[in-house]
C-alpha cells in the first residue's frame, strides 16, 4: 500500500519548482497580479531548480496549481488607520492593544503549561511501559532496537529529557554501554518531534493554515528521521560519535558545574504543580529492573519527607547471613544482625488536585491527557485568533519582513545560520525544544513565518536542547558526570551532523520538500495527518520492536524486502520525473498499479464511510469538537453551526488537488462575511495597531 495522493494518468511533470537559494519562500513565476502574493519588496533571490515541492517520496505529480498554497497570506488591515483616529479612538485602541497583548501572553502561558501537563499525562499513561522497554537486554546488541525504544519511550513520556536521563542513569550504573545508548538518544530525538506535530493537528480547521502548520511541524520529524537514516548506519559502522565524545570527555578535567537555569519552568511550575506532580524516579527505577518500583505510583503524594539513616536489628536465618561477625548475636532462639536502613518519614503532602484521590495512574493520566489536549487546543485557537487580529497590515509586514527576509548580498547565506542560533538560544531559554517548536507551529500556520525560515529555527532548537543537556550533565554527581556528559555530547554531535547533512546546501534540504509534500497530502486528506502520526511514531517503531524481539533473522527477513521495495519505488519515482524515456512505457507512470496502491482516494472513501456517523452530528457541540471532527471525517458540510471547518469547499468538492482558502481575507470572520455566512460586524471598531 502506498499512501500517496492521486496518481491517475499523471505523466512526469516537467514543471520545476523554484526555491530561493538562501531558503526563501518558494515563489511561483509571475505572481505579481495576485492579491495573496508575499510582500513584493523582498530582495531578489538567486533561484535554483528543485524537485516538486511535495515529498520526494511521493509517487505522483499533481496538476499544477493556479495558486501556490505555500505563499504567505497577506493579512490585510480592516481597521481604521492610526492617523485617522480621534484621541478617544487612539486611547481605546491602545488599551485594546494592551488587552490583546495580556490575553496573548496569558494564552501562551497556559499553552506552555498544557504542554507540560500533556507530558505528565503521557508519563502517567505510558511511563511504566516506557521504563520496561529499557529493561530489554537486546538493546545492547541491536542498535535498531535501541533506536525504536528511544522513539517509543520519548513518545510515551513526551519528554526527551526524561528518556535521556533514564539512559544516563543506566549508563552510570553500567546497565548500558555508551555504544548501546547512542541509538536510544537518536530515537529520543525523533520522539520529541511528535509534540509539535500534535499541536499542528489542532489547526485542522482551516485547510491552508493546516497545510502550513503541519508542514512546519513535520519538517522537524523529517529532519530527525533522515538524520537517523544516514547517521545510524554510519555510527554502527564507524562509532564516530562514541569516539569523538570519548576523546572530548577524556581530554577535559571537568568540575561539577551548576544546574542549567530553569527559566521557563520558574514561571510555569507554580501552576503545573497545582495540577499534578510526578515522581519521575519511578520510571528510571523500572528501567533499572527495580521490582518494587513496578507497584509504585508515579503521582507524587508526599512532597516534604525526612530521610533518617538508622541501624535496626533484624533476624537472619543463620550467622552466615550476618552483616559481619562482630555484628551478630542471638537471643537464644533467633540470630540477629544490625542493618543500616534509610527511614523515610513523610512530613507534608503535595498540594495538587490528585493528591487525595488515590486514583490509578492510568485514570489520572487519561483525565489529564483529555484536559491538557482541550486546553492546548483552546489556547491554540485563541492564540491564532489574537495573532490574526494583531498581525495585520503594517504590523504583519514589519514582522514578516524581519523574520523572513535574508541579509543583503553577499551575506544572504548567513541568515539561516543566524536563525539556527536564534532557535538554539530560544530553546535554551525555554529549556524545551517541544515548547519552542510547538510555539512556532501556529505562527507558521497563520503565515507569519515561512517553512524555509522555520526549518533553521527548528534545527537550532535541536541544538538548544542538547546544550541544556550538556549543562545538566556538568551538574551531575561525580559518578554520573562522565557518562551523562558523553551522552549529552553524542546528542549534540548527532544534531550537528544532521545539520551538516540537511542544511548547508539548499539542494539537500529534503526535509522542507518532504514536509511540504506531506502538508499538501494532509490538507487534502486531513485524516492522513493522524495516519502519519500513528504510522511513524507508533506502528513502525512497534513493528521493529516486535521483529527485533523475534531475533535478527526475522528482522532481516522482513526488513530487507521492505527496504528493497522502498528503494525500488524511490528510484522508479526519480526516473519517472527526471528521465522517463529510459523506462518502459508501462513504468513511465503508476497506472499499472491498482487504484488503492497509487491513490488515497479509495482510502478516503473508506475513512469517510467509517467516520460518516460523525458527519452531521458532532460538530455542532463546540469549536474544539468541530476541529476534532474535521480532522477525522474531512467533511465540508458537518460544521453548519460553528462554521469552523468551512473552507469554501462546496465550490471545489469535485476537485482532486488541494484547495487553498482565499487568503485575501485577513481572518475567518471577514472571509465569512464576504460569503454572507455571518452578519457583518462593525469592522470600524476593529483595532489593529498595537
Amino acid at each position: 500500500m502506498a499512501p500517496w495522493p492521486e496518481l491517475g494518468d499523471a505523466q512526469p511533470n516537467p514543471d520545476k519548482y523554484l526555491e530561493g537559494a538562501a531558503g526563501q519562500q518558494p515563489t511561483a513565476p509571475d505572481k505579481s497580479k495576485e492579491t495573496n502574493k508575499t510582500d513584493n519588496t523582498e530582495a531578489p533571490v538567486t533561484k535554483i531548480e528543485l524537485l516538486p515541492s511535495y515529498s520526494t517520496a511521493t509517487l505522483i505529480d499533481e496538476p499544477t496549481e493556479v495558486d501556490d498554497p505555500w505563499n504567505l497570506p497577506t493579512l490585510q488591515d480592516s481597521g481604521i488607520k492610526w492617523s485617522e483616529r480621534d484621541t478617544k479612538g487612539k486611547i481605546l485602541c491602545f488599551f485594546q492593544g494592551i488587552g490583546r497583548l495580556i490575553l496573548l501572553l496569558g494564552f501562551l502561558y497556559f499553552f506552555v503549561c498544557s504542554l507540560d501537563i500533556l507530558s505528565s499525562a503521557f508519563q502517567l499513561v505510558g511511563g511504566k511501559m516506557a521504563g520496561q522497554f529499557f529493561s530489554n537486554s537486546s538493546i545492547m546488541s541491536n542498535p535498531l532496537l535501541g533506536l525504536v525504544i528511544g522513539v517509543l519511550v520519548t513518545v510515551l513520556v513526551q519528554s526527551s529529557s526524561t528518556s535521556t536521563s533514564i539512559v544516563v542513569s543506566m549508563v552510570s550504573s553500567s546497565l548500558l554501554t555508551v555504544r548501546a545508548a547512542i541509538p536510544i538518544i537518536m530515537g529520543a530525538n525523533i520522539g520529541t518531534s511528535i509534540t509539535n506535530t500534535i499541536v499542528a493537528l489542532m489547526q485542522v480547521g482551516d485547510r491552508s493554515e493546516f497545510r502550513r502548520a503541519f508542514a512546519g511541524a513535520t519538517v522537524h520529524d523529517f529532519f530527525n528521521w533522515l538524520s537517523v537514516l544516514v547517521l545510524l548506519p554510519v555510527e554502527v559502522a564507524t562509532h564516530y560519535l562514541e569516539i569523538i565524545t570519548q576523546l572530548i570527555v577524556e581530554s577535559f578535567h571537568f568540575k561539577n558545574g551548576e544546574d542549567a537555569p530553569d527559566l521557563l519552568k520558574v514561571i510555569t511550575k507554580p501552576f503545573t504543580k497545582l495540577i499534578v506532580q510526578l515522581d519521575k524516579k519511578v520510571i528510571s527505577q523500572i528501567a533499572m529492573n527495580d521490582e518494587k518500583a513496578k507497584n509504585k505510583s508515579l503521582v507524587k503524594i508526599w512532597c516534604k519527607t525526612f530521610t533518617n539513616k538508622t541501624q535496626i536489628n533484624v533476624t537472619v536465618p543463620s550467622t552466615a547471613n550476618c552483616t559481619s561477625p562482630s555484628l551478630c548475636w542471638t537471643d537464644g532462639i533467633q540470630n540477629w544482625t544490625m542493618k543500616n536502613v534509610t527511614y523515610k518519614e513523610n512530613i507534608a503532602k503535595c498540594q495538587h488536585i490528585f493528591v487525595n484521590f488515590h486514583l490509578p495512574d492510568l485514570a489520572v493520566g487519561t483525565i489529564l491527557l483529555i484536559l491538557s489536549l482541550l486546553v492546548l487546543c483552546g489556547c491554540l485557537i485563541m492564540i491564532v485568533k489574537i495573532l490574526g487580529s494583531v498581525l495585520k497590515g503594517q504590523v504583519a509586514t514589519v514582522i514578516k519582513k524581519t523574520i523572513n527576509t535574508d541579509f543583503p548580498f553577499p551575506f544572504a547565506w548567513l541568515t539561516g545560520y543566524l536563525a539556527i542560533l536564534v532557535g538554539a538560544g530560544m530553546t535554551f531559554i525555554v529549556q524545551s525544544s517541544s515548547v519552542f517548536t510547538s510555539a512556532l507551529t501556529p505562527l507558521i500556520g497563520i503565515g507569519v513565518i515561512t517553512i524555509e525560515r522555520a526549518y533553521p529555527l527548528t534545527l537550532g532548537s535541536n541544538i538548544g536542547t542538547t546544550t541544556t543537556a550538556i549543562l545538566a550533565a556538568l551538574a551531575s554527581p561525580g559518578n554520573a558526570l562522565r557518562s551523562s556528559l558523553q551522552i549529552a555530547l553524542c546528542h549534540f554531535f548527532f544534531n550537528i551532523s544532521g545539520i551538516l547533512l540537511w542544511y548547508p546546501i539548499p539542494f539537500t534540504r529534503l526535509p522542507i520538500r518532504m514536509a511540504k509534500g506531506l502538508g499538501n497530502i494532509s490538507a487534502k486528506y486531513r485524516w492522513f495527518a493522524v495516519f502519519y502520526l500513528i504510522i511513524f511514531f507508533f506502528l513502525i517503531p512497534l513493528t521493529v520492536f516486535g521483529l527485533s524481539l523475534a531475533g535478527w533473522r526475522v528482522l532481516v527477513g522482513v526488513g530487507v524486502p521492505v527496504v528493497f521495495i522502498i528503494i525500488l519505488v524511490l528510484c522508479l519515482r526519480l526516473l519517472q520525473s527526471r528521465c522517463p524515456r529510459v523506462l518502459p512505457k508501462k513504468l513511465q507512470n503508476w497506472n499499472f498499479l491498482p487504484l488503492w496502491m497509487r491513490s488515497l482516494k479509495p482510502w478516503d472513501a473508506v475513512v469517510s464511510k467509517f467516520t460518516g456517523c460523525f458527519q452531521m452530528r458532532c460538530c455542532c457541540c463546540c469549536r474544539v469538537c468541530c476541529r476534532a471532527c474535521c480532522l477525522l471525517c474531512d467533511c465540508p458540510k458537518c460544521c453548519r453551526c460553528s462554521k469552523c471547518c468551512e473552507d469554501l469547499e462546496e465550490a471545489q468538492e469535485g476537485q482532486d488537488v488541494p484547495v487553498k482558502a482565499p487568503e485575501t481575507f485577513d481572518n475567518i470572520t471577514i472571509s465569512r462575511e464576504a460569503q454572507g455566512e455571518v452578519p457583518a460586524s462593525d469592522s470600524k471598531t476593529e483595532c489593529t495597531a498595537l
Partner: antibody, heavy 120, light 107 residues
C-alpha cells in the same frame, strides 16, 4: 512485678526423667524468650536451651539435644522442662530465666531454681 | 561452641579498692557480652549487657568495656555487698556460654 516461681526439688534415679515447671506472673508470658540454665554444685552456669512461648519455637544446646524438651502452656503462663536419661552429672540447680531486653540473650529475671539430685 | 575464659578465678581485696575482672572469648563476639553477679544461695543477677550497658538498678561503680574477644568488668570502689561470684556470658552464637566465674572476697 515479674516473678518466676519454680517447682520443688526432685530426687531421681539414673536413667529416669524429670519434668520441672516455671510459673510466671507480672508480664505477658508470650512476649519474652524463656531460657533454662543449670549450675552444678560449686560450678559455673551452663545454658540448656530456650523457648519462645508465643510460637513455641525452641533452641537447644547440642550437648542436651535429644534429652531435653522445652514446652510452654500459654493458658497457665507456665514453662516446662523435661530432661530424660538422667545421669549423676545432671545433678544441679536448674534455673528458668527470661530476657526482657529484646533481641538479646542477656537474661535479667531468674527463678529461684529447682535442685535435681540424680542418685541411685 | 564459643569458650569464655574468665580470670582471675578468685580474688581477695579491700573495701574501696578497684577490682578488674577480664573475660576472653575464643572467637569474635562483637559486643554481645553480659556480666552477672551471683551471691551465695541466690540466683544470678544481670549487671551489664552489650558489654557496657548497665542494667536498671545497677550502681554506677560497675562498668564494662571491650569488644571482639577481650572484655573487662570493673568495680570502681569495692563495697561489702559486692562480695559474690561474677560471670561473663556471650550471646553472639548459640549455644550461649558462660565464663567459669570470678569469686570476689574482702580481706
Amino acid at each position: 512485678q515479674v516473678q518466676l516461681v519454680q517447682s520443688g526439688a526432685e530426687v531421681v534415679k539414673p536413667g529416669a526423667s524429670v519434668k520441672m515447671s516455671c510459673k510466671t506472673s507480672g508480664y505477658t508470658f508470650i512476649t519474652y524468650n524463656m531460657h533454662w540454665v543449670r549450675q552444678a554444685p560449686g560450678q559455673g552456669l551452663e545454658w540448656i536451651g530456650a523457648i519462645y512461648p508465643g510460637s513455641g519455637d525452641t533452641s537447644y544446646n547440642q550437648k542436651f539435644k535429644g534429652r531435653v524438651t522445652l514446652t510452654a502452656d500459654k493458658s497457665t503462663s507456665t514453662a516446662y522442662m523435661e530432661l530424660s536419661s538422667l545421669r549423676s552429672e545432671d545433678t544441679a540447680v536448674y534455673y528458668c530465666s527470661i530476657s526482657t531486653i529484646i533481641t538479646t540473650g542477656a537474661v535479667d529475671y531468674w527463678g529461684q531454681g529447682t535442685l535435681v539430685t540424680v542418685s541411685s | 561452641d564459643i569458650q569464655m575464659t574468665q580470670s582471675p578465678s578468685s580474688l581477695s581485696t579491700s573495701v574501696g579498692d578497684r577490682v578488674t575482672i577480664t573475660c576472653k572469648a575464643s572467637q569474635d563476639v562483637g559486643t554481645a557480652v553480659a556480666w552477672y553477679q551471683q551471691k551465695p544461695g541466690q540466683s544470678p543477677k544481670l549487671l551489664i549487657y552489650w558489654t557496657s550497658t548497665r542494667h536498671t538498678g545497677v550502681p554506677d561503680r560497675f562498668s564494662g568495656s571491650g569488644s571482639g574477644t577481650d572484655f573487662t568488668l570493673i568495680i570502681r570502689s569495692l563495697q561489702p555487698e559486692d562480695v559474690a561470684t561474677y560471670f561473663c556470658q556471650q550471646y553472639s552464637r548459640i549455644p550461649l556460654t558462660f565464663g567459669g566465674g570470678t569469686k570476689v572476697e574482702i580481706k
